[in-house]
C-alpha cells in the first residue's frame, strides 16, 4: 500500500521572538529523500523554495531559511511543505514569528529558544500533491 508522506515540521532558531534587525533561521524537516523544501507565509503566493537539502539523520532531511535582518514586515505565520518525488507533502503547522523593538522594555518577551511546530493529525490537504509553481526568484538563504 502507498505510504502517505509525513507532514513536515518547522522550527526557528534562536526562537520565535526576534529583536528588530537580528537574524532568524527557519528550519524545515521532513523524511529522507526530500528534494525541495518550501517556506510559505500565510498567503501561499509568498514563498521561498530551496534545493539545498541536507541529511539531518539517516531518516530525516532538513533545509534552513535565514533572514539576516528581521523587520516588522517579517512578523507573522510561517509553515513548511516539501517535494519528495513524485509528490508534494501537506503543510506543517504554522509557526508565528514575533518581532520586538530592541529597546527591550519590561513587558517585552524574551527570545524563545527552540520554538517549533511539529506534525499533528488533521484532515488531509492534497492541494500541493502536484508539482507546485517554480520558485519566485528569492534567494534560498535570504527570504526577504
Amino acid at each position: 500500500q502507498e505510504e502517505d508522506l509525513p507532514r513536515p515540521s518547522i522550527s526557528a532558531e534562536p526562537g520565535t521572538v526576534i529583536p528588530l534587525g537580528s537574524h532568524v533561521t527557519f528550519v524545515c524537516r521532513g523524511p529522507v529523500g526530500v528534494q525541495t523544501f518550501r517556506l510559505e507565509r500565510e498567503s501561499r503566493s509568498t514563498y521561498n523554495d530551496t534545493e539545498d537539502v541536507s541529511q539531518a539523520s539517516p531518516s530525516e532531511s532538513e533545509a534552513r531559511f535565514r533572514i539576516d535582518s528581521v523587520s516588522e514586515g517579517n512578523a507573522g505565520p510561517y509553515r513548511c511543505i516539501y517535494y519528495k518525488p513524485p509528490k508534494w507533502s501537506e503543510q506543517s503547522d504554522y509557526l508565528e514569528l514575533l518581532v520586538k523593538e530592541t529597546s527591550g522594555g519590561p513587558d517585552s518577551p524574551d527570545t524563545e529558544p527552540g520554538s517549533s511546530a511539529g506534525p499533528t493529525q488533521r484532515p488531509s490537504d492534497n492541494s500541493h500533491n502536484e508539482h507546485a509553481p517554480a520558485s519566485q526568484g528569492l534567494k534560498a538563504e535570504h527570504l526577504y
Epitope: E2, G33, Q35, E51, D52, V53, S54, P85, P86
Partner: antibody, heavy 121, light 109 residues
Framework: EQSLEESGGDLVKPGASLTLTCKAS?????????MCWVRQAPGKGLEWIAC????????TYFASWAKGRFTISKTSSITVTLQMTSLTAADTATYFC?????????????WGPGTLVTISS | ELVLTQTPAPVSAAVGDTVTIKCQAS??????LAWYQQKPGQPPKLLIY???TLASGVPPRFKGSRSGTEYTLTISDLECADAATYFC???????????FGGGTEVEIK
C-alpha cells in the same frame, strides 16, 4: 543482496522496435524509489533515458529527447521494461537499468551489468 | 535544459596524488547531485550523493563539495584502482531531468 539484470538486447535493423527488460533480485519496487534506464554508446558518456516510480502510481520522467519514442513500464513488482521504437544507428549502446532510492537521495544504485543493443542494416 | 559541464578531461596523476574534478551546473540544483565511478566493461558505481555524502562502502579518500553551481569531487591519496571515468549527475526529479555530465577520465601515471 540487491541486484538488477537487463535482458532483451539484440542486433536489429534501423526502423525496428525492441523491448528491454530489467529484473530485480533481493527487493521489490516500493514507494521509496524509482526504476530507471540509462544508456552508453560505445566509448561515450552516460545518457539518462527515463525513470518510473516504484509506488502505486505510474509517474514517469523522461529525457526530452526520449519522449514519444521510448516507453517505460512496470510489468510486475520486480520487473520494468523499456520499449523503443523507430530505432536508428544512434541508438546503438549498452542499456543499463538502475534503482534510484530515497535513502541515497535518488543517486542510482545498484546498476545492472547492461545489455547491448546494436542497430545496423 | 540543465547542462552539467565536467572539467578537466582527461586528468593524469601519480599514485599518492590528489585529483580534483569539477562539475559546473547551468542551473542551481542545490545539493541534488551525485558522483559515479565507472571502469571499462563495468556499470557505474555510486560514490557520492547529496553533493557530499559518501555512499555505503566508499572510502573517505573520496570527497564531494559544492560552491553555488560548481560541484567538486576530490580524490586524495590516489591509488591504481582509482583509474576510471568519473561522472556527475543531477538527481533532481523535475522538468530538467536527471542529466549526466560528460565524464572525466582519470589515468595513473
Amino acid at each position: 543482496e540487491q541486484s538488477l539484470e537487463e535482458s532483451g538486447g539484440d542486433l536489429v535493423k534501423p526502423g525496428a522496435s525492441l523491448t528491454l527488460t530489467c529484473k530485480a533480485s533481493g527487493f521489490s519496487f516500493s514507494s521509496s524509489e524509482f526504476m530507471c534506464w540509462v544508456r552508453q554508446a560505445p566509448g561515450k558518456g552516460l545518457e539518462w533515458i527515463a525513470c518510473i516510480y516504484g509506488g502505486l502510481s505510474d509517474d514517469t520522467y523522461f529525457a526530452s529527447w526520449a519522449k514519444g519514442r521510448f516507453t517505460i513500464s512496470k510489468t510486475s513488482s520486480i520487473t520494468v521494461t523499456l520499449q523503443m521504437t523507430s530505432l536508428t544507428a544512434a541508438d546503438t549502446a549498452t542499456y543499463f537499468c538502475a534503482r534510484s532510492c530515497d535513502v541515497n537521495y535518488y543517486g542510482f544504485d545498484p546498476w545492472g551489468p547492461g545489455t547491448l543493443v546494436t542497430i545496423s542494416s | 535544459e540543465l547542462v552539467l559541464t565536467q572539467t578537466p578531461a582527461p586528468v593524469s596523476a601519480a599514485v599518492g596524488d590528489t585529483v580534483t574534478i569539477k562539475c559546473q551546473a547551468s542551473q542551481n540544483k542545490g545539493t541534488n547531485l551525485a558522483w559515479y565511478q565507472q571502469k571499462p566493461g563495468q556499470p557505474p558505481k555510486l560514490l557520492i550523493y547529496l553533493s557530499s555524502t559518501l555512499a555505503s562502502g566508499v572510502p573517505p579518500r573520496f570527497k564531494g563539495s559544492r560552491s553555488g553551481t560548481e560541484y567538486t569531487l576530490t580524490i586524495s591519496d590516489l591509488e591504481c584502482a582509482d583509474a576510471a571515468t568519473y561522472f556527475c549527475q543531477s538527481t533532481y526529479y523535475g522538468s530538467n531531468g536527471l542529466t549526466f555530465g560528460g565524464g572525466t577520465e582519470v589515468e595513473i601515471k
